[in-house]
Every structure is written in structure tokens, then in C-alpha cells.
């Protein structure tokens, strides 16, 4: 039961962390004009990913893309890149998560499998938070240096008598969305990695073992007793589950807590 | 079609508070913001404040402890208040609708204000 | 405060000929978010309102005839009436609508020689 809700709750912790993230790589605040000891203007300007804005006191917002590519800064590439990588990750972490989850029967899949699908889809999570953290971390980055640079000449002198006002920018709302969607995903994926642990069936006192007669069927020996000696070149020691006795190639396909390191 | 319209008293006393009235029709107070400017007889422009769709407002610098803006949505009239007027306030004032790059498209047609004993 | 200054005060020119209005702000007027300057021109006939004429410095109000044109950029402006008409006698003014507060500049009184 517990593994269940550590999964669904990993699950949806994703979810919210996942669209948190596309949301903030959609946004147009990544950065905003600094309001803070500067001249009080008629316009206010803010940056996204893909576009700037200008929304003006009049109440009019006009925004421009950025229609260039090689004329971006590279910091804005991989921020762009950085992102797109944790959508896509997330997004397919998802789908994954969904087959995984031990409350949706599909078919006669295995527990094994599920853990599998629930470990992968964990890691997918921790990667796209990694990446989402990352990419709005260096554009955080990026803004305080611009920021020490444009206060150091915040007033550019224009034949000693005219100002320019110096447009500086800080934090937007689409950096608190992106480290807190960024944070939520990793979150998510590592709540995802233990269920799986708890999905893979342990290794507990064997019940009995299972061992190949050359080239006749698969022989038990009840009683918790190991086998140590074989009767041709091909038999293998097996280890069976509590689960009860099962085929060579069905015990194989469970994983054990130390297939993933 | 758009209009604006000032309406207020032509003549206040000296230290007395101006209370004027700017009704807007062909347009909605939420889409547009509203601009107060005056102009004494025969001189320029002088800009007072505005109030913005939200309802925020900023205001001139040399009136600021003076002057209110103020509007009710739902009658399409934005107010405008100046306190403690001496006869330097005697002009004629006008509201009008920010446009693109702030700059006035519509105007009222101003209502004239004598400050007086 | 920005400070707007106009040049000339008043301006006599003949029919048909060019007129020009220089207007100069103490700061710059160019945001450069969209790269626009926030300049506005107007023009006031006696016993009317301001008519708005020009925005963004250069950007022809509709309805505005198009020998009214307005250029510059940062601190300096111009507005220039290609070809002058009976019609065109009054007031002009330049305003700053970039930063607070939103002041004009003195007028220039356009009148017909």
C-alpha cells in the first residue's frame, strides 16, 4: 500500500513539476525591467525565452519574437536547449510512469516490469528537474552579471548634458515558476526510484531451489535446501521467491534492488 | 463613437478642494486608461496624472501631495480631485484616452476652472 | 523631471512651402525593450482640444493627412509639414510619454506668411 502511494504520489508530484516546467519555458517573464531606483517610465519591458515585451500605461502589450537564431546569445540557446531537453524527458517520464503504475493493470504485466518502467520513469523525472533547474539557473546567472554591468554605467553620459536611461532587468516570475516546477520534478522522480524499490520483490530465505537435469525438465527440491552439486554441465544453483516455484526464465525476469546502481 | 466628457464646477474657492467629473462613452474604462491635462489661458500643456485599467495611477511630481484620480468602471467615469487650489490652478482642464505609445487620441473638450473668492 | 524644449516659438511660412518643428528632450526617449521612442506630437487650434497627430515618434495617427511627418531618434525630433495648408494654422506640441511625468514641450505657433 505504501508503495502505491509513494508511486501515485511521485506520480503526480511529477505531473505538477512537468507542467510547471513547460509553463515557465512558455512564459514571457524571465526577466523584467528593475523597477528599483530607476526613473519611473511609461513602458514596462520583460523577456521570455522566445520573445520580448513591452506592455505600455496606456494598457497596450505589443510583443516581438526573437526571429533570429544565430543571432541569439548562446547562454539563451542552451537555456532554450536545457529546457526543451526537460520537457521532453518529463513528458516521456510520464508516459512511462503511467504503464508503471502498480494501481493500472495492463495486460499480465509483471511486477518486474513495473519496477523497471517505475525506475526508469524516476530517473527520466530527476534528469528533467536536473535540466529545468539548470537552464533557469544559468539564465539567473546571466541576469546578474547584465545587472553589475548595466548599474556600472546606469547613466551614460550623452555630451555631459543628456541621460540615457539604461534599462536594467531582474528576476521574472517564469524563474521562481521554473526552480519550483525544477524542484517538484526531481522530487517526483526520486519519490519514483524508492517505490521502485519497494515494486522489485526482495530476497528472503529461499523456499526452494530450482536447478536444470541436463536436458530434461526443471527438477525442485523443497525444503530450503541448496543444491550444491550438479548433474551435468548446464545446472545452475537458482534462487526461488516466496512467491513459489516458478520457471528459470520467469525468476530471471524479476529484477532485484541491485540490477540499477 | 468615443467621447469624453469634463464636467465640475467653473469656479472654486482659494485652499477649497477642485472635484471634477470625466463620462466616457464608446469605450470601457477596463480596456482603456484615462489621462488628466490642463492648460492656464493663453500658456501650455501641463500633465496631472493618470489612472491606468487596473486602477493604479500615477501622478505629476509638482502635484502629487495635491492631486487623486480616481473612476468608477460601472458608470464609465473617472474623477479627478486637487486640493488646497490657489489661482495658479485656474485653467482648463481635460481628460483624455491613452492610446498607443501613451500618447492621447481622444479628448474631452476641456471644462474651464477659475479659482477664486 | 525631463525637460521638452521646442524650437522655433513661432514659425511664419508661405502656403504650399515645408515647415519644420525641432523638439529636444534632457533625456533620451528610446526604450529599448521595442526600440521605440516615446515621443508624441500634437496639434491644438484655437478653442479646440489637442488632435493627436503623430506617436512613436513617427507613426502617423489614422485619419492624419501625410504630409505630417515625424523623424528623430533619443533626444531629438522633428516634425515636418511637407507642404502647408490654410488648415494647418495652430499650436504644435511634443510630449514625452516615456518617463514620469509625462511633460510637454512649450508649443510652436505655426502660422501662415
Known amino acids: 500500500m505504501a508503495v502505491t502511494a509513494c508511486q501515485g504520489l511521485g506520480f503526480v508530484v511529477s505531473l505538477i513539476g512537468i507542467a510547471g516546467i513547460i509553463a515557465a519555458t512558455c512564459m514571457d517573464q524571465w526577466s523584467t525591467q528593475d523597477l528599483y531606483n530607476n526613473p519611473v517610465t511609461a513602458v514596462f519591458n520583460y523577456q521570455g525565452l522566445w520573445r520580448s515585451c513591452v506592455r505600455e500605461s496606456s494598457g497596450f502589450t505589443e510583443c516581438r519574437g526573437y526571429f533570429t537564431l544565430l543571432g541569439l546569445p548562446a547562454m539563451l540557446q542552451a537555456v532554450r536547449a536545457l529546457m526543451i531537453v526537460g520537457i521532453v524527458l518529463g513528458a516521456i517520464g510520464l508516459l512511462v510512469s503511467i504503464f508503471a503504475l502498480k494501481c493500472i493493470r495492463i495486460g499480465s504485466m509483471e511486477d518486474s516490469a513495473k519496477a523497471n518502467m517505475t525506475l526508469t520513469s524516476g530517473i527520466m523525472f530527476i534528469v528533467s528537474g536536473l535540466c529545468a533547474i539548470a537552464g533557469v539557473s544559468v539564465f539567473a546567472n546571466m541576469l546578474v552579471t547584465n545587472f553589475w554591468m548595466s548599474t556600472a554605467n546606469m547613466y551614460t553620459g550623452m555630451g555631459g548634458m543628456v541621460q540615457t536611461v539604461q534599462t536594467r532587468y531582474t528576476f521574472g516570475a517564469a524563474l521562481f515558476v521554473g526552480w519550483v516546477a525544477g524542484g517538484l520534478t526531481l522530487i517526483g522522480g526520486v519519490m519514483m526510484c524508492i517505490a521502485c524499490r519497494g515494486l522489485a520483490p526482495e530476497e528472503t530465505n529461499y523456499k526452494a531451489v530450482s536447478y536444470h537435469a541436463s536436458g530434461h525438465s526443471v527438477a525442485y527440491k523443497p525444503g530450503g535446501f541448496k543444491a550444491s552439486t550438479g548433474f551435468g554441465s548446464n545446472t545452475k544453483n537458482k534462487k526461488i521467491y516466496d512467491g513459489g516455484a516458478r520457471t528459470e526464465d520467469e525468476v530471471q525476469s524479476y529484477p532485484s534492488k541491485h540490477d540499477y546502481v | 463613437q468615443v467621447q469624453l466628457q469634463e464636467s465640475g464646477p467653473g469656479l472654486v474657492k482659494p485652499s477649497q478642494t477642485l472635484s471634477l467629473t470625466c463620462t466616457v462613452s464608446g469605450f470601457s474604462l477596463t480596456s482603456y486608461a484615462i489621462s488628466w491635462v490642463r492648460q492656464p489661458a493663453g500658456k501650455g500643456l501641463e500633465w496631472l496624472g493618470e489612472i491606468w485599467t487596473g486602477g493604479g495611477t500615477n501622478y505629476n511630481s509638482a502635484l502629487k501631495s495635491r492631486v487623486s484620480i480616481s473612476k468608477d468602471n460601472s458608470k464609465s467615469q473617472v474623477f479627478l480631485k486637487l486640493s488646497s487650489v490657489t489661482a495658479a490652478d485656474t485653467a482648463r482642464y481635460y481628460c483624455?484616452?491613452?492610446?498607443?505609445?501613451?500618447?492621447?487620441?481622444?479628448w474631452g473638450q476641456g471644462t474651464l476652472v477659475t479659482v477664486s473668492s | 523631471d525631463i525637460v521638452m524644449t521646442q524650437s522655433p516659438d513661432s514659425l511664419t511660412v508661405s502656403l504650399g512651402e515645408r515647415a519644420t518643428i525641432n523638439c529636444k528632450s534632457s533625456?533620451?526617449?528610446?526604450?529599448?525593450?521595442?526600440?521605440?521612442?516615446?515621443l508624441t506630437w500634437y496639434q491644438q487650434k484655437p478653442g479646440q482640444p489637442p488632435k493627436l497627430l503623430i506617436y512613436w515618434a513617427s507613426t502617423r495617427e489614422s485619419g492624419v493627412p501625410d504630409r505630417f511627418t515625424g523623424s528623430g531618434s533619443g533626444t531629438d525630433f522633428t516634425l515636418t509639414i511637407s507642404s502647408l495648408q490654410a488648415e494647418d494654422v495652430a499650436v504644435y506640441y511634443c510630449q514625452n510619454n516615456f518617463i514620469y511625468p509625462l511633460t510637454f514641450g512649450p508649443g510652436t505657433k505655426l502660422e501662415i506668411k
Open positions: 483624455g484616452r491613452l492610446s498607443y505609445g501613451n500618447s492621447l487620441d481622444y
Open positions: 533625456q533620451s526617449l528610446l526604450n529599448s525593450g521595442n526600440q521605440k521612442n516615446y
